[in-house]
Amino acid sequence: ESLGWDIAELQLNHTGPQQDPRLYWQGGPALGRSFLRGPELDKGQLRIRRDGIYMVHIQVTLAICSSTSTSRHHHPTTLAVGICSPASRSISLLRLSFHQGCTIASQRLTPLARGDTLCTNLTGTLLPSRNTDETFFGVQWVRP
Amino acid sequence: ESLGWDIAELQLNHTGPQQDPRLYWQGGPALGRSFLRGPELDKGQLRIRRDGIYMVHIQVTLAICSSTSTSRHHHPTTLAVGICSPASRSISLLRLSFHQGCTIASQRLTPLARGDTLCTNLTGTLLPSRNTDETFFGVQWVRP
Amino acid sequence: ESLGWDIAELQLNHTGPQQDPRLYWQGGPALGRSFLRGPELDKGQLRIRRDGIYMVHIQVTLAICSSTSTSRHHHPTTLAVGICSPASRSISLLRLSFHQGCTIASQRLTPLARGDTLCTNLTGTLLPSRNTDETFFGVQWVRP
């Protein structure tokens, strides 16, 4: 572990209460194929424990969704991944809108520091799928 | 190679016969920019030869496709990547529907074991593009 | 650095003049969360300085875009990532069309050689967003 191979792959646990757009994540072999090796969860949010450049990736699929759901009927649905704490480092890292699709997936390289907590904010009126092959979120340390 | 840097990037060879939703892959420098360094192909399916956590990624583009093709005219098209053998480890790792798009692309971290064979199942009534910059599938060992 | 951990994450600087479909990139801590560690920029295009297999990833979001923008009103919008020089190695590595969406995101593994310059060509009549969480392009050396 001293090599700094910090890595995590999380599955969706639940959405937040009414005014909280955050997705709450969980991980661990008992839950399926999710895991945390280095990073940790703090009330469902992912906290980084080692400085470095990370590959952050996410896929979110909307539940009971058709292309008409995301286009006409509903409020625009957007997913943003960002550092939400500490407040001094708050920033949006990755943002996608669903438009006429029901799934977004992306990835990016970004510097993260020990103590950074990543939040994934889903705005809109559709629920994310909890299927582990449809919605997941992960980070991988790639270099100092 | 003892570092465990197993890696592969594959291009589409062909689709399966009528009742077989699997995509059949090929790789090697003679074919273009695809390669296998560690993992191997078994009848067009990717077999893992080293335990570890892997980054699995895929992009599939549908042939002669327009947004109307995938939404209204045609049967819903879905791509699923999973472990298909050994049967005891069979599971879906990654699933995406095309909805009103003609391309899906995603990636995820997942633990894989020596002998796991990955299958990519494309259901629907549209063909995948065989262009090597539009359809590809790869894995990268990232840590034990 | 001798480990060969070449890595870069770039943000959009500007689009090219009328007949030039290339996107021009910039990177560096002073600009935000973009960086170049090994690869370098040559007139806004990314040049590789170390042979190896790289993970190339990109996300491009179209500015002031709705799903109707990309489908009905406008010329088909496509993003292609390729080696544009040296001419002898010119090839398209990754290609995506926007169809009814406003964002494309993908990634792939590909062998790159010292001196390869990567170009990202955006064809169509819509501008890419310059927001750093919506449009970015990066490479990561993963093995020799």
């Epitope: - | 042939a63 093709s69 209204r72 009534t125 | -």
Partner: antibody
Framework: QVQLKQSGPGLVQPSQSLSITCTVS????????VHWVRQSPGKGLEWLGV???????DYNAALMSRLNITKDNSKSQVFFKMNSLQTDDTAIYYC?????????????WGQGTLVSVSA | DIVLTQSPASLAVSLGQRATISCRAS??????????LHWYQQKPGQPPKLLIY???NLESGVPARFSGSGSGTDFTLNIHPVEEEDAATYYC?????????FGAGTKLELK
């Protein structure tokens, strides 16, 4: 196995309309599209149109104003209607479909309906 | 519309010999790594029978003496060795875009 069976009149008066029914078995019209093709000595094989799984249609532009293709999924029937027939519409009319995909190549054909346009 | 030109219009081949039929498209019928060109055989009183799809894929149940090749705009159907039951008219067809179109046909007779 997959079958397409056609029924319809053999003789049509000029300026009248033609109606043919294609009844399909062993596949669902909610999954696959059904195409129509005709064959005449003068024009050879000519693609006429298609009805997709959702009921939307594409027609040969040269004939679009005269064609109407509809279906009844529950009865597994596709209905082909062509208006204002003239003598050069005399042909064998076929319904056809692909085996697995929605591209226009055709392993499966109806038996054909010979249509003569004559006073 | 894409025009498909078949040649020859007819040919006579001896049993066991090779028959070669050409089909030329007015513009490319290739896309997405495929050539959307197909071949049919038709005998009198029957609908066309699909032999080959996507240039070179043999339809189920079609004998291996039938083969197809080509790309872009130029395509070939080969029959070797020709057998008695192969006497028929052969058509090429594209499905690159709408409308799909057919060639005018090549009539194969046995010497």
């Amino acid at each position: 196995q997959v079958q397409l069976k056609q029924s319809g009149p053999g003789l049509v008066q000029p300026s009248q309309s033609l109606s043919i029914t294609c009844t399909v078995s062993d596949f669902s019209l909610t999954i696959f599209g059904v195409h129509w093709v005709r064959q005449s000595p003068g024009k050879g094989l000519e693609w006429l149109g298609v009805i997709w799984r959702d009921g939307s249609t594409d027609y040969n532009a040269a004939l679009m104003s005269r064609l109407n293709i509809t279906k009844d999924n529950s009865k597994s029937q596709v209905f082909f209607k062509m208006n204002s027939l003239q003598t050069d519409d005399t042909a064998i009319y076929y319904c056809a479909k692909n085996r697995r995909y929605d591209y226009a190549w055709f392993p499966y054909w109806g038996q054909g309906t010979l249509v003569s346009v004559s006073a | 519309d894409i025009v498909l030109t078949q040649s020859p219009a007819s040919l006579a081949v001896s049993l066991g010999q090779r028959a070669t039929i050409s089909c030329r498209a007015s513009k490319s019928v290739s896309a997405s790594g495929y050539s959307f060109l197909h071949w049919y055989q038709q005998k009198p009183g029957q609908p066309p029978k699909l032999l080959i799809y996507l240039t070179s894929n043999l339809e189920s149940g079609v004998p291996a003496r039938f083969s197809g090749s080509g790309s872009g705009t130029d395509f070939t159907l080969n029959i070797h060795p020709v057998e008695e039951e192969d006497a028929a008219t052969y058509y090429c067809q594209h499905s690159r875009d709408f409308p799909p179109t057919f060639g005018a046909g090549t009539k194969l007779e046995l010497k």
